[in-house]
Amino acid sequence: FERTRSLQDPCSNCPAGTFCDNNRNQICSPCPPNSFSSAGGQRTCDICRQCKGVFRTRKECSSTSNAECDCTPGFHCLGAGCSMCEQDCKQGQELTKKGCKDCCFGTFNDQKRGICRPWTNCSLDGKSVLVNGTKERDVVCGPSPADLSPGASSVTPPAPAREPGHSPQ
C-alpha cells in the first residue's frame, strides 16, 4: 500500500525537515530558515515559534522540530506548551488579579506559584498539631493526644479560623 501511495503521491516521500515543493515539480525542498516540518509528506513548512519578551528559548528550532519556550526568571509557564508566562510570587503568597497577596490566616503556599491552601486539619485524622502552620508551611501533625505519654504535651491546635472575606485583588 505504501508503495502504491508513493507512486500516486510523490510528496509522501518527502521526509521531515523538507516540504513538497509544488513550484518545482513536487520535489522535496529543505525547509527555509526559521521554519520546520516535524512529519513527512508536508506541502509547507511551519514557521518556528519565537520566544520573545517574557518568553525565553528553551530549545532552538530545527528543520524537524519547533522551538520550545520557557519564561524569564521571576515568571513561570502556564498553559499547554508554555502559552503564557505568569509572574512568580514569594512563598506565603498567591497571585491574584491585583498581583501577589499574602496567604490568609489558616492557609499556606510553599511554592512561588499556585494558590494558598488550607492548613491540614490534624484532628480529622485523630492527631494533634505538633508544629503550627505559617503562611509558608503547613502544620505538622503529631501523634493523637491519646498516644502521648502522661505528662507529655503538644502544641494546642489553633481554633478553626473563619477566613475573613477579602476581595480577590
Epitope: L78, G79, A80, S83, M84, E86, Q87, E94, L95, T96, K97, K98, G114, I115, P118, E163, G165, S167, P168, Q169
Partner: antibody, heavy 118, light 110 residues
Framework: EVQLLESGGGLVQPGGSLRLSCAAS????????MSWVRQAPGKGLEWVAN????????YSVDSVKGRFTISRDNSKNTLYLQMNSLRAEDTAVYYC???????????WGQGTLVTVSS | QSVLTQPPSASGTPGQRVTISCSGS????????VYWYQQLPGTAPKLLIY???QRPSGVPDRFSGSKSGTSASLAISGLRSEDEADYYC???????????FGGGTKLTVL
Amino acid sequence: EVQLLESGGGLVQPGGSLRLSCAASGFTFSNAWMSWVRQAPGKGLEWVANIKQDGSEKYSVDSVKGRFTISRDNSKNTLYLQMNSLRAEDTAVYYCARETNGGAFDIWGQGTLVTVSS
Amino acid sequence: QSVLTQPPSASGTPGQRVTISCSGSSSNIGSNYVYWYQQLPGTAPKLLIYRNNQRPSGVPDRFSGSKSGTSASLAISGLRSEDEADYYCAAWDDSLSGWVFGGGTKLTVL
C-alpha cells in the same frame, strides 16, 4: 487536550429556570478561578459571575444578583450556573471560561445558547 | 452602555496599522490590568493580550497592547484579512467587584 464543554442551554419561558454545566478537562480544575461570560445575539461580551478555586468567594454582575447562582464541584471537574426568574434580556450564548490566577480568560468553551421567550 | 468605551468600528487596508482604544476609569483600567480578546465570526473569544501588553504564544507580534492612566489601546500592524474580527478590552473593576468589558470594536479589512 485542555477543554471546556458547556451544556444545559435551551428554550425557556420568562420566569423559568435552567441550570448550565461546564465540564472541564485537560487541566487541574480545582486550581482555577472560573467564570461565566454571556453574549446576547449580535451584541458584545458581558461577564456574568465567577467563583474561586474552593468556592469560598463568588462575584456576579448586578443584573443577575439574586437570580443566578454560580457553583462548582471540584470532584466532578464541573462548573454550574443556576439561572432562576429568567427574563427575555437573559437570552444569550453563555460561555464558561478559565481565569488564570493573574486574571486572564485563557480558555473558553464553545458556548451554549439560552433563549428566554414565551 | 458598557463600562469600558471602545469605538464600535475600525477599518484599514492590508499592511496598514490600526489602533483600537479602550477608555475606562480609576476603578478599572486605572488600577488594574487590561486584557484584549479577539472573536472571529461564529467562534468563542480568544485571549490576545494579557496584563496590559503581554502576548500569549501563538499570537503574532503584529498585535501589541499598551496602557496609560485610565485608557488602553490595541495596535495591529501589518493588517491582514484574517484579522477581521471583533475585539474586546476587559479589566477588573474594584468598585463593581466584577469584570467589565468594552462594547467591542468590529475591525474590517478593506
